[in-house]
């Protein structure tokens, strides 16, 4: 059936995506996350940069901080004190690593409309936060922690041993920031601000990675980062808690590490306050299959913390590592001792469990051949969580509510039927006591953010629906996307295929595999994106496929832990298997197949190209790992064990890209890396290049001077332009 003529003419006015569209971010979307300040109020930065307070119940809103005040100190961020008397304004943002940055902070007094003068904060500050009640300030400056009872007061110095690259107080070192805490901070206020807990990281004995930063000077400077690679000496961590009401009285009190963890190298993984006088610490053995959750109580008589063994809960994995990417954190119930936590059930699926006394007696709250992904909030009568249960699509996320006040508990999917076609991947943000919540839908349709009543789940209003984006896309020929699965040898391989707008199954198309494939990752997700691969399908007529193979997340431990101690084997096999299945579908030109990936994906794409299958004509590796001996201890050892003879050295050696240098002879290989990559060091690509040269194998390469793992700014444009040329040449597409 031919569509009516009018559609044809409309089709003619529609255009394909251009690379320029992608590089300019023309089709980027917005989300709306309320900055909750109570059960029914939130702050939001308006389009004209005023900070506005919204009251859901009265429907009123008013500006608490004008754009003029923001502009007066060039503020790019703000934070309201819980007593609403002060706001900190953040300016001079200077990025350090993934989460960390330094900034200048100004305190604005809302009661008199003036900046606080006297006892101003030093600069630059590494981290600053308000207490959860009142307006105490804790901040980290030059690796030491300071406390102010009020913004205008002189500071009380809590730690004195902070030293650049040696001792970190209240902030993580590189490896803890990137691989364990995933935050820029390592200090935690108790719920009412009585106590302040903090971590001290001692990096004195950690080997240092050094690389040149070229800059503009006559001599490049050297960046030095204490960075433990696999098997190296690790940071040494201690946890302290100080009474902020009388900080000088007994000073910081150390919370001892559990004896079962203390006997060998260990990590601290997270801290959760339960009440002002009860805290929960999580610890992990260096061999990351044993985690201990320890609930500690303040002992008034001793003025210190006691962590009874009866309040120690051990989580152990016999088939892989503990947890998913990280060990999950507990969400405590109102009795302040029992908690909800996600961990593997007996069938090997991550589910919510309720722990009242021992882990052995845990009550399973969710179950099935799907996974619970995040616990958002526990109230007196409800537990809100996300999972990929609905319709058995692992790449979806829906929000559920379980009634915990009644027995048996009843489960309701809050999001499954709201905007079924448009929205299949949600996250949520809850106000105090879950009185209200915002839902943020990421796709597969255009993202939309909505506000809901926490009792009835009724939608109150749309917070952001991306109307401008919707209008802008009306005359764009977007590619078609489909998410399906392949069943191969008892393994389910989910894939996303991105097809050119006028896709015709009877024709042959070049295929590009985009791969990440790292442990506990997921690439096949029902989310909206207009990005480089959308352009390649829309304009250049390529078919792009993403495949989640063994080692990927949210489909059970069998798939997840399949790669344990064997990185670089099954991830590659599964990409190759999928390509063979795609060829069988009949519309892939098997002489024009490429693979590309970034980071872990660069490692997998390199190994796939060097697999000797002859499947791939060409491929690209951006900032790849080339040997697991070069990557961070915390990440690498979680999946690979130690690079020692009596552990797993053999597979460390077998799984390098360099060991396969000869196999690159019959493929076109483009190797790309930033010289200032603090994460996957340039060393990785330098070693690949050396091995290829030594094997006399031709290849292409591009470095980005002074760029880190993200290759941002102008480098991004250059990178995608360069990769586009490479692929078009490989696929014999006209430029």
């Amino acid at each position: 059936l031919r569509p009516p003529r009018v559609h044809n003419s409309e089709e003619n006015t529609m255009r394909a995506l251009t690379l320029k569209d992608i590089l300019n971010g023309t089709f980027s979307y917005k989300t709306f996350f309320p900055n909750w300040i109570s059960g029914q109020e939130y702050l939001h930065q308006s389009a004209d940069n005023n900070i506005v307070l919204y009251n859901i119940e009265t429907g009123q809103s008013y500006t608490i901080l004008s754009n003029r005040t923001m502009k007066s100190v060039n503020a790019s961020n703000y934070g309201l004190s819980p007593d609403r008397q002060f706001v900190y304004l953040e300016s001079d943002y200077s990025k350090l690593w993934r989460y960390s940055y330094t900034a200048t902070y100004y305190i604005y007094d809302l009661s008199n409309g003036e900046f606080v003068r006297g006892n101003e904060l030093p600069r630059p500050i590494q981290y600053l936060c308000w207490s959860p009640v009142g307006s105490k300030l804790a901040y980290v400056y030059q690796n030491n922690i300071y406390l102010k009872q009020r913004p205008g007061d002189p500071p009380f110095q809590i730690t004195f041993n902070g030293r650049e690259n040696k001792i970190f107080n209240g902030i993580p070192d590189w490896v803890y920031e990137e691989e364990m805490l995933a935050t820029k901070y390592a200090l935690w206020w108790s719920p009412n601000g009585k106590f302040l807990a903090y971590a001290e990281f001692n990096d004195t004995d950690i080997p240092v990675i050094a690389y040149s930063y070229y800059g503009d000077e006559q001599y490049p400077r050297t960046i030095n980062i204490p960075y433990p690679k696999a098997g190296a000496k690790n940071p040494f961590v201690r946890i302290f808690i100080i009474d902020t009401t009388y900080p000088a009285y007994v000073g910081p009190q150390e919370v001892p590490v559990p004896a079962m963890i203390a006997s060998s190298d260990y990590y601290f993984s997270w801290l959760t306050w339960v009440t002002d006088e009860r805290v929960c610490l999580q610890w992990l053995k260096r061999v990351q299959n044993v985690s201990v959750l320890s609930i500690c109580d303040f002992r008034e008589d001793w003025q210190t913390w006691d962590c009874p063994k009866t309040q120690e809960h051990i989580e152990e994995s016999r088939t892989g590592w503990a947890g998913g990417f990280f060990v999950s954190t507990p969400v405590f119930s109102y009795d302040a001792i029992s908690y909800y936590k996600i961990f593997s059930d007996k069938d090997g699926y991550k589910h919510i469990h309720y722990i009242k006394d021992t882990v052995e007696n845990a009550i399973q709250i969710t179950s099935g051949k799907w996974e619970a992904i995040n616990i958002f909030r526990v109230t007196q009568d409800s537990l809100f969580y996300s999972s990929n249960e609905f319709e058995d699509y692992p790449g979806r996320r829906n929000i559920y509510r379980i009634s915990i006040g009644s027995y048996p508990p009843s489960k309701k999917c809050v999001t499954c039927h709201l905007r079924k076609e448009r929205c299949q991947y949600y996250t949520a943000s809850f106000s105090d006591y879950a009185k209200y919540y915002a839902l943020v839908c990421y796709g597969p349709g255009i993202p939309i953010s909505t506000l809901h009543d926490g009792r009835t789940d009724q939608e109150i209003k749309i917070l952001e629906e991306n109307k401008e984006l919707e209008n802008a896309l009306k005359n764009i020929q977007l590619p078609k996307e489909e998410i399906k699965k392949l069943e191969v040898d008892e393994i389910t391989l989910w894939y996303k295929m991105i097809l050119p707008p006028q896709f015709d199954r009877s024709k042959k198309y070049p295929l590009l595999i985009q791969v990440y494939g790292g442990p506990c990752s997921q690439s096949v997700r029902s989310v909206f994106a207009v990005n480089w691969i959308s352009y390649l399908a829309s304009k250049e007529g390529m078919v792009i496929a993403l495949v989640d193979g063994r080692g990927t997340a949210f489909q059970g431990d069998k798939l997840l832990y399949a790669v344990y101690r064997k990185l670089g084997v099954y991830e590659v096999e599964d990409q190759i298997t999928a390509v063979r299945k795609f060829i069988e579908m009949g519309f892939i030109d098997e002489k024009r197949i490429a693979i590309w990936g970034w980071s872990y994906g660069g490692y997998v794409s390199s190994l796939a190209l060097a697999s000797g299958t002859g499947l791939f004509k060409c491929g690209i590796a951006v900032a790849p790992v080339s040997s697991w001996e070069y990557y961070a201890s915390v990440y690498t050892e979680r999946f690979m064990g130690l690079p020692t003879k009596d552990d797993n050295l053999e597979h460390y050696k077998n799984s390098t890209v360099m060991a396969r240098a000869e196999y690159f002879r019959n493929v076109d290989y483009l190797l790309i890396h930033g010289t200032a990559d603090d994460n996957v060091h340039f060393q990785n690509s330098a070693q690949i290049a050396k091995a290829l040269v030594n094997a006399q194998v031709d290849f292409q390469a591009m470095w980005y001077s002074d760029q880190n793992h993200g290759l941002s700014g102008l480098s991004t444009n250059h990178l995608y332009t360069h990769m586009t040329h490479f692929l078009k040449q490989c696929f014999s597409l006209s430029d």
Partner: antibody
Amino acid sequence: QVQLVQSGAEVKKPGASVKVSCKASGYTFTGYYMHWVRQAPGQGLEWMGWIYPNTGGTNYAQNFQGRVTMTRDTSISTAYMELSSLRSDDTAVYYCARDDYNKNLDYWGQGTLVTVSS
Amino acid sequence: DIQMTQSPSTLSASVGDRGTITCRASQSIGSWLAWYQQKPGKTPKLLIYKASSLESGVPSRFSGSGSGTEFTLTISSLQPDDFATYYCQQYNSYFRTFGQGTKVEIK
């Protein structure tokens, strides 16, 4: 095999201080908490506190707060217990003992007799 | 602090008798209780850990039971070598406490 060897007997005057050492061998010294326990003549066992050799972190029983100091030297795998302002009722045998997660105090030093007498 | 109360203070028994010592904790300590035997002039020796686990090398006539706040050390058939003082110790808390001891003497 695990061994804890303590320093020899001491005689001290009231008001003085005593420092008892405990040298560990046969295991990773930094991996186990070290406790100190004392026993006055004809009396029961009294827990004094512990030190975690890895960090030097300590916890003392209330009876000894302010008078006891536990330290360690990891380079020679030795723990120390110093008791100050000695009184005659501090006359006792002082033991160091290793803390195993499951077994509690599984290995003990041979004991050091401290006599406080004017 | 967790108080540990042992009873009896003295147990007079004959060789071959069954001996029972109890230990009561002032609050729940789970199974984190150890029993020690001490002979005059000697170092305490670990007998039982985790309330009921027998330390290797300790004769099987020794057994421990209990959890929470009530614990028992039983010697099924007293031998001449068993006449000594016995101590319980809780190790649930970072702040360890011993019972006051029970002397097992020959009747």
